[in-house]
Structure formats: structure tokens, C-alpha cells
């Protein structure tokens, strides 16, 4: 058993049929010695008396808010949560496996630049009695500070018969060094509590591996005289690291109709302009990627050919 | 050339060669990018490799103030990786094909280090750690980790030279 926060404790249980469970001793936080009784949740049934209560925690029915009282007055609470371990593996019932970029990916994180700011998100089908708490650091043995905000519900989607909820959190490394080569990964730890179930999820990454620039901005077209060709120009996204002579991007320019199966023109360039062939009812799209490190491409920025 | 006396390197040549190093580092093992090597316990490998750190002057302001600190750090790293790629980690079993991207990578690391430090000038270099894995599978894993680390190192070096070529070239 360990303390998650004040008056909230996590009991770690091996979860299998007829498991013996864990013996837990609760102590009432009071100078009083006599006339103390214990109850669980809203029940008025007295579970025991005395300053301490010893219980055998085996299942969710044994978890909850234990309260010690004296003469009708509440002295203190202890909330017990369960953390299940099945076949040596901690349960992951609360969050959905996003399966990208690999199986058992519960947390996904992205950064728009090298400033040390990043966003992580996760999915669940649970809509109520759900809380998250996020901590982060650079490295684990001698951790350097990363400050995370509160996790918020960022999107709701309908998937078949189920509703899916996306939560996200923004974090910022306290002393980021955008130009340095990272040697210690960022660690992100998410505590998830659903009713009386506790689970924790972690992710470890270098900022360079989660970079995904915003799409290029200000796409403009200039038709070339006596030609089917069009010069398309664009700018670096505002959110990308500066100076651009140091933090350079490379670009993919594509002309395509509405359907992915339609024919297309495609060219890669390090410049912020390119010459392509525009077709009626097609769009010109441009996306960006770090020039020197193969992290994710940005989403496409598009303008119609016409 | 970035000689210890403090003259400027051939920024444009260094830029071209460092960009080539980036391409080579990713083509030497593109799948490295899809392996989560941190799960394999990185400490003994990548903690020993020279990283370009915050105080090394490789940021745009540091380069403007005095590029020598950064160039020396890059040179150290190039020599270090060049030695690693020439060591039995890469020459032992399972054997790499001759003329593989690793071979070209090795040659290009040497080429860039020589551009930075001509014959007769010497910056101190970092000792290469004694990493001699006994099993072929350990060697393979170590290769992946070294290449992954090299990808990060040459990306920073390429940024430095691109910025230098754009803003510091005479």
C-alpha cells in the first residue's frame, strides 16, 4: 500500500481467483484514543472500533472511503483504491490502446517545435467518475523539471455504438534547450482513477522523436506565362522554432484531385516555393518535416488550383 | 577551416557534408526509427557518447559569439562515432555488406572531421568506451542504438553548419 495523495491510498493486488489479498491497517488521524468506530462509504454498518482498523482487501467491495467517527463526529477519512496486477502485468482497463505507432500505446505525445513544450493525449470510453493526474520530468534518476497543466477533455467521438473521449494535457520543460542534442528522455506519468480503480500509464520519449510541425502557412499561387505550370509559395508555420536558418524544414508539394486514387503531381523541396502542374478541380497541398531528423510530417495545408 | 587558432570553417562544404551524413544515418538503418530502444536499457551505451549539450555553444547565439567551442564539440563527436563505426561492433558478426550505408557513413564522418581539423592541428578527443558485446544479437542491438544516437548528433551538427553557411560565411 502507498499514498497517492493526502488520505488516498493505493492497494496493489495480485488479481486471480481466491487470491488472499492484502492486509491493510488503517489509522485514524486523531489524538483521540477511545470510542472510535469505523464505517465504509455511505453505509452506517460499524466495521470495527479503536484507533486502528485491520482489513483484508481482496476485491473492489473492500475498497472505498473508510471513515473513523467519534460520537457522530467524523474524525478522518482514508480512501482506498485498488491497482490490479494480473499475471504479473498491471491492468490497463481505463485507457484505450491507440496501437500507433505500436501496440500498448496508451499515451501519445507531439511537439510543434523544439521549445520543450509538448502535448499528450489519451482515449477512454469511460464518461463518469474519472480523474487524471499528470507528472513529467526529463530523465528519471536525476530528474529535471517539466511542468504539466491539468488534463482536460479535448474531444468526444462516436465510434460505432461507443462514445470515445479524448483527454489531453500540455507540458513545458522548465529549462529547455532547443539547440541541444537530448541525451535523457522526457518521462510522462499519468495516474488514472475510475471509481475505485487506480492505474498508471507512462511514456518515455525525446522531443526530437515527437516533433510534428504545424502545416506551412500562407500558401499562394502564381500562374506561369505560356505554361500549365504554377509557382506555389508558402511560409514556415508561426509555431516552428527560429531562426529558420538553424531549425530548417523540408517540404512535400502535391497536386491532387478530391480522390486519393486520382493522378497527382508531387515534388520535394527545401525551398519555400515550387513549380507544379495545376489541374482543374485539383488542390495544391504542402506539408513540412524537420530537414535533418526524420520525425513526423505535418498535416497538409491546401489551396484550390482554380 | 575550423582550426584551433580560430579561423572559420568552410561552412558551405560542411553544410553539404553534414546534410549527407543525415541522409546516410537514416538510410543506414531506417527501421531504427521504429524501434523503441530505450526499453532495452540505454545507459551503458548512449551515456558514453558525446552529446552536444546546452553549454557547448551550438545554439545560434553561441555560434555568433564564438563558433570554436561548438565546432570542437562536433569534431570530438565525429571522431568518436567514426571510431565506433570502425570498431568490431560494426565489423564483427553479423557482418555488414561491403559498401553499405554504414561504410559510406564511416567515410563521411571522417571527411567532415578532416574538414573541421586539417592535418597537424589537434583538439583533444574523447576516449571511445570499451563496448565489446559478446553475442551477435547484442552487437546488432548496439548498432541500432549507436545509429539512433548518431542520427540525433548529426541532426544538430547539420543545423549548426546550415546556420553557419547562411549567416556566418564570409
Amino acid at each position: 500500500i502507498w499514498e497517492l495523495k493526502k488520505d488516498v491510498y493505493v492497494v496493489e493486488l495480485d488479481w486471480y481467483p481466491d487470491a488472499p489479498g492484502e492486509m491493510v491497517v488503517l489509522t485514524c488521524d486523531t489524538p483521540e484514543e477511545d470510542g472510535i468506530t469505523w464505517t465504509l462509504d455511505q453505509s452506517s454498518e460499524v466495521l470495527g472500533s479503536g484507533k486502528t482498523l485491520t482489513i483484508q482487501v481482496k476485491e473492489f467491495g473492500d475498497a472505498g472511503q473508510y471513515t473513523c467517527h467519534k460520537g457522530g463526529e467524523v474524525l478522518s477519512h482514508s480512501l482506498l483504491l485498488l491497482h490490479k496486477k494480473e499475471d504479473g502485468i498491471w491492468s490497463t482497463d481505463i485507457l484505450k490502446d491507440q496501437k500507433e505507432p505500436k501496440n500498448k500505446t496508451f499515451l501519445r505525445c507531439e511537439a510543434k517545435n523544439y521549445s520543450g513544450r509538448f502535448t499528450c493525449w489519451w482515449l477512454t470510453t469511460i464518461s463518469t467518475d474519472l480523474t487524471f493526474s499528470v507528472k513529467s520530468s526529463r530523465g528519471s534518476s536525476d530528474p529535471q523539471g517539466v511542468t504539466c497543466g491539468a488534463a482536460t477533455l479535448s474531444a468526444e467521438r462516436v465510434r460505432g455504438d461507443n462514445k470515445e473521449y479524448e483527454y489531453s494535457v500540455e507540458c513545458q520543460e522548465d529549462s529547455a534547450c532547443p539547440a541541444a542534442e537530448e541525451s535523457l528522455p522526457i518521462e510522462v506519468m499519468v495516474d488514472a482513477v475510475h471509481k475505485l480503480k487506480y492505474e498508471n500509464y507512462t511514456s518515455s520519449f525525446f522531443i526530437r522523436d515527437i516533433i510534428k510541425p504545424d502545416p506551412p502557412k500562407n500558401l499562394q499561387l502564381k500562374p506561369l506565362k505560356n505554361s500549365r505550370q504554377v509557382e506555389v509559395s508558402w511560409e514556415y508555420p508561426d509555431t516552428w522554432s527560429t531562426p529558420h536558418s538553424y531549425f530548417s524544414l523540408t517540404f512535400c508539394v502535391q497536386v491532387q484531385g478530391k480522390s486519393k486514387r486520382e493522378k497527382k503531381d508531387r515534388v520535394f523541396t527545401d525551398k519555400t516555393s515550387a513549380t507544379v502542374i495545376c489541374r482543374k478541380n485539383a488542390s495544391i497541398s504542402v506539408r513540412a518535416q524537420d530537414r535533418y531528423y526524420s520525425s513526423s510530417w505535418s498535416e497538409w495545408a491546401s489551396v484550390p488550383c482554380s | 577551416r575550423a582550426v584551433p587558432g580560430g579561423s572559420s570553417p568552410a561552412w558551405t562544404q560542411c553544410q553539404q557534408l553534414s546534410q549527407k551524413l543525415c541522409t546516410l544515418a537514416w538510410s543506414a538503418h531506417p527501421l531504427v526509427g521504429h524501434m523503441d530502444l530505450r526499453e532495452e536499457g540505454d545507459e551503458e551505451t548512449t551515456n558514453d557518447v558525446p552529446h552536444i549539450q546546452c553549454g557547448d555553444g551550438c545554439d545560434p547565439q553561441g555560434l555568433r559569439d564564438n563558433s570554436q567551442f561548438c565546432l570542437q564539440r562536433i569534431h570530438q563527436g565525429l571522431i568518436f562515432y567514426e571510431k565506433l563505426l570502425g570498431s568490431d561492433i560494426f565489423t564483427g558478426e553479423p557482418s555488414l555488406l561491403p559498401d553499405s550505408p554504414v561504410g559510406q557513413l564511416h567515410a563521411s564522418l571522417l571527411g567532415l572531421s578532416q574538414l573541421l581539423q586539417p592535418e597537424g592541428h589537434h583538439w583533444e578527443t574523447q576516449q571511445i568506451p570499451s563496448l565489446s558485446p559478446s553475442q551477435p544479437w547484442q552487437r546488432l542491438l548496439l548498432r541500432f542504438k549507436i545509429l539512433r544516437s548518431l542520427q540525433a548528433f548529426v541532426a544538430v551538427a547539420a543545423r549548426v553548419f546550415a546556420h553557419g553557411a547562411a549567416t556566418l560565411s564570409p
Epitope: 500549365r228 505550370q229 523540408t250 486514387r261 486520382e262 493522378k263 497527382k264 503531381d265 508531387r266 515534388v267 520535394f268 523541396t269 527545401d270 513549380t275 502542374i277 489541374r279 482543374k280 | 538510410s27
Partner: antibody
Framework: EVQLVQSGAEVKKPGATVKISCKAS????????LHWVRQRPEKGLEWMGW????????EYAPKFQGKVTITADTSTDTGYLELSSLRSEDTAVYYC???????????WGQGTLVTVSS | DIQMTQSPSSVSASVGDRVTITCRAS??????LHWYQQKPGKAPKLLIK???QSISGVPSRFSGYGSGTDFSLTINSLQPEDFARYYC?????????FGGGTKVEIK
């Protein structure tokens, strides 16, 4: 199977005009760009130009501008290359090539040898 | 126009050898480079697109690398059917241009 079948070899006199064809099958003709590429005897490949069969748009290499005309007939799924004012240096194998992507060549015809000789 | 220079113009090799052909562009073309194989009397065949992207149906012994101005095509463990002429082609800008070709012949 995507296929391009070209018309047979031609022998022409200098100053004449020749029109060679390229019949597409195995795909929707207007879904691919169609290019023509020249290969002179014992020489390399030279891109001549392309056509978008969907709308008839064409683009030619400056070297071949005025010398060649590329057309397409969507009713017969056939592309054409017309070469005018033939000279002996126009003796070559002419390939049609197609792709959904404009700038490289995924599918090739078997080639048509045009010989210009007096 | 962008000039493409291939080297060597010919190379002699044996079955099982590893062969590398290089292609240099007269200006930077990013990764807009493609490789073709042509056997005598036949049309060219696409091997690699955008410098390093493999083409389905092409044996994995063919690999490409490069960006900017310098590119290479490597054939690992040369097979009897690989003796042919190889061309690079840039697609950075029109007119599209090819390298002069490299003939891989039997030693």
C-alpha cells in the same frame, strides 16, 4: 494488368511526318498521365513531353517544342506522338510511358523504332 | 535544364557482387530522383522512386540513397538477370532529364 502497346516500326523519308500510337489497357485511360521518351541508337533516354488525357493538357521539353505533337483519344484509349519535318537524327526508338504520378514513369510501352532514311 | 551525370559509365562485375552506381545533379534536387533498369531491346523498368522508396515487385537487393545533388543505387548480390543498363532521372523541374546511363556487364 496495366499495359501500353505501341504501333509497329516506321521507315520515313527526311522531311516527312510520322504519327505513332500507344494503346492503353488495364486501367482507366484518363486516370494516368501519358509521356513520350526518345532513345537514339546507343544513346540515353530523353523526355519529350506529356499529355493529360482527361483534358488534353500538354507540356513539351523545350528541345522538342514545335517538333512534336502529343494527342490522346479517350474513346479508343490511345495516345499519339506526331513527329514532323523528320531528319536522320530523329531515327530512334520512341517509348510511351504512363503513371498516376506526373514526374516519373511506372508503365512503359515496348517502344516503336522510327527510321529516317533517304 | 538540370544535368544528370552518372558514374561509372560501365562496370564489370560477377554474380554475387555488390555494385554501386552514382548519379550527380547539376543543382540540388532534394529527393526528386528515380532509378530505372533497361535490358537490351526492352523498355526501361522503374526500380526506385524518390531516391530511396522501393517499388513493389522489385527485388529488395536494389536500394537507393541520397538527397540534394548526390545519389546512389546499390545492387546487393548481383544476379544474372541484373546485367543491364541503369538510368537515373530527376523530377525536380521540367524538362525531366535522365543520366547518361551505367552499363553493368559480366566480368
Amino acid at each position: 494488368e496495366v499495359q501500353l502497346v505501341q504501333s509497329g516500326a516506321e521507315v520515313k523519308k527526311p522531311g516527312a511526318t510520322v504519327k505513332i500510337s500507344c494503346k492503353a489497357s488495364g486501367y482507366t485511360f484518363s486516370d494516368y498521365y501519358l509521356h513520350w521518351v526518345r532513345q537514339r541508337p546507343e544513346k540515353g533516354l530523353e523526355w519529350m513531353g506529356w499529355i493529360d488525357p482527361e483534358n488534353g493538357d500538354t507540356e513539351y521539353a523545350p528541345k522538342f517544342q514545335g517538333k512534336v505533337t502529343i494527342t490522346a483519344d479517350t474513346s479508343t484509349d490511345t495516345g499519339y506522338l506526331e513527329l514532323s519535318s523528320l531528319r536522320s537524327e530523329d531515327t530512334a526508338v520512341y517509348y510511351c510511358a504512363a503513371n498516376k504520378e506526373l514526374r516519373y514513369f511506372d508503365v512503359w510501352g515496348q517502344g516503336t523504332l522510327v527510321t529516317v532514311s533517304s | 535544364d538540370i544535368q544528370m551525370t552518372q558514374s561509372p559509365s560501365s562496370v564489370s562485375a560477377s554474380v554475387g557482387d555488390r555494385v554501386t552506381i552514382t548519379c550527380r545533379a547539376s543543382q540540388s534536387i532534394s529527393i526528386n530522383l528515380h532509378w530505372y533498369q533497361q535490358k537490351p531491346g526492352k523498355a526501361p523498368k522503374l526500380l526506385i522512386k524518390f531516391a530511396s522508396q522501393s517499388i513493389s515487385g522489385v527485388p529488395s537487393r536494389f536500394s537507393g540513397y541520397g538527397s540534394g545533388t548526390d545519389f546512389s543505387l546499390t545492387i546487393n548480390s548481383l544476379q544474372p538477370e541484373d546485367f543491364a543498363r541503369y538510368y537515373c532521372q530527376q523530377s525536380n523541374s521540367f524538362p525531366l532529364t535522365f543520366g547518361g546511363g551505367t552499363k553493368v556487364e559480366i566480368k
